[in-house]
């Protein structure tokens, strides 16, 4: 079982390999001096059906270095950074792990791209192994919230508060149900 030629990369190089490319072979990508690698640099030849070989992920890309690029602090609820620190410049990567009792969906690493956004995939998410729900939020005096149901709310959902005419909302307008089963903030109040 073997893999076909690894996907090419513009403005970069692929590590040496011999053919046929055996299952288990790793090839590594790197970029020319003025370019930055975005994505996983190592691809692995695997087989999913014990018949054909395939590369385990897409090739990374080489972006022309933008010295002005900088990315915001990436936040993964239920997770924490195991690699990477601010400031985040073009080509820098951040790797996440999930807290105990959370499992990861998506790719654990992201890269700061020339467009100041993390990529090439979305930030991973950490999902509770024991699906927790947030308790019902109370109604507030002289105001109301979007969730009229009295039951608990699933993580990832949010509740928006608003005040009646003539009243000012003090506190958070939108409160998110976190994967920990806790609300992101206490309910606001409506004051005259």
């Amino acid at each position: 079982i073997s893999c076909g030629s690894p996907p090419p990369i513009l403005n970069g190089r692929i590590s040496y390999y011999s053919t046929p490319i055996a299952v288990g072979t790793v090839i590594r990508y790197s970029c020319s001096g003025t370019f930055r690698l975005i994505g996983e640099k190592s691809l692995l030849c695997i087989t999913k059906d014990k018949v054909d070989g395939t590369w385990d992920k897409p090739a990374p890309k080489c972006e022309y270095f933008n010295k002005y690029s900088s990315c915001p602090e990436p936040i993964v609820p239920g997770g924490y950074k195991i690699r990477g620190s601010t400031p985040y410049r073009h080509g820098d990567s951040v790797t996440f792990a999930c807290k105990t009792n959370f499992s990861m969906n998506g790719n654990k690493s992201v890269w700061c791209q020339a467009n100041n956004m993390w990529g090439p995939t979305r930030l991973p998410t950490c999902v509770s192994v024991f699906p927790l729900e947030c308790p019902a939020l109370p109604m507030i005096h002289n105001g109301h919230h979007t969730s009229e149901n009295v039951g608990s709310i699933a993580p990832g959902l949010s509740v928006t508060y608003s005040c009646e005419s003539g009243y000012l909302l003090v506190g958070e307008k939108i409160i998110n149900c976190l994967s920990s089963g806790k609300w992101s903030a206490v309910p606001p109040t409506c004051e005259e």
Epitope: R13, S15, Y16, Y17, S18, V23, G24, V26, R28, S30, S42, L44, I46
Partner: antibody, heavy 119, light 106 residues
Framework: QVQLVQSGAEVKKPGSSVKVSCKAS????????ISWVRQAPGQGLEWMGR????????NYAQKFQGRVTITADKSTSTAYMELSSLRSEDTAVYYC????????????WGQGTLVTVSS | EIVMTQSPATLSVSPGERATLSCRAG??????LAWYQQKPGQAPRLLIY???TRATGIPARFSGSGSGTEFTLTISSLQSEDFAVYYC????????FGQGTKLEIK
């Protein structure tokens, strides 16, 4: 940090086989590759082969092809290296070493297992 | 197999001085090179990877440089605990190690 604990020293006769184990604790066994590296007395390090436990894929250095078998038991987070048709030149300390994902370099090493081949 | 050659085989340096160890690859390996330290009776310990990135917990006096076929490990001010054998390892095409450089007290 991942801890790798290897089985104890072995004395073997020429022509026989030896099986060394390497138990990992900490981290996720499925997220890394385990290599076996040996070191003959007073000599340098020699890569023998490696396995990616989650895939069950093992690859071997040409020199050891056909004589070494590397396996892994995901349920016990243990990797094994079996070397057959032993000869005196196989007397060495055998190390297991871990690379995170498929990084290529070894963050963690076992304590080593001395295998002595003598008649 | 990519052949890795280290020089010198033995290097004698006084504590507090600078030590420079060399590693040459038989073909270009980009920056896919790691350095390890090994003391008698112990397993190797990762110092540097990707030619110049220090591993977690490695003191700043250790630095790596180079790309392609020529690489250097520099220890800026030798401490007593730095006297050991140092190995380079390539991971451009499978894996192979240099024969080692023994760093001894002058």
């Amino acid at each position: 940090q991942v801890q790798l604990v290897q089985s104890g020293a072995e004395v073997k006769k020429p022509g026989s086989s030896v099986k060394v184990s390497c138990k990992a604790s900490g981290g996720t066994f499925s997220s890394y590759a385990i290599s076996w590296v040996r070191q003959a007395p007073g000599q340098g390090l020699e890569w023998m082969g490696r396995i990616i436990p989650i895939l069950g894929i093992a690859n071997y250095a040409q020199k050891f092809q056909g004589r070494v078998t590397i396996t892994a038991d995901k349920s016990t987070s243990t990797a094994y290296m079996e070397l057959s048709s032993l000869r005196s030149e196989d007397t060495a300390v055998y190390y297991c070493a871990r690379e995170e994902d498929i990084s290529g370099y070894y963050q963690d090493w076992g304590q080593g297992t001395l295998v002595t081949v003598s008649s | 197999e990519i052949v890795m050659t280290q020089s010198p085989a033995t290097l004698s340096v006084s504590p507090g001085e600078r030590a420079t160890l060399s590693c040459r690859a038989g073909q270009s390996i980009s920056r896919y090179l790691a350095w390890y330290q090994q003391k008698p009776g112990q397993a190797p310990r990762l110092l540097i990877y990707d030619a110049s990135t220090r591993a977690t917990g490695i003191p700043a006096r250790f630095s790596g440089s180079g790309s392609g076929t020529e690489f250097t490990l520099t220890i800026s001010s030798l401490q007593s605990e730095d006297f050991a054998v140092y190995y380079c390892q390539q991971y451009e095409y499978w894996y192979s190690f240099g024969q080692g450089t023994k760093l001894e007290i002058k």
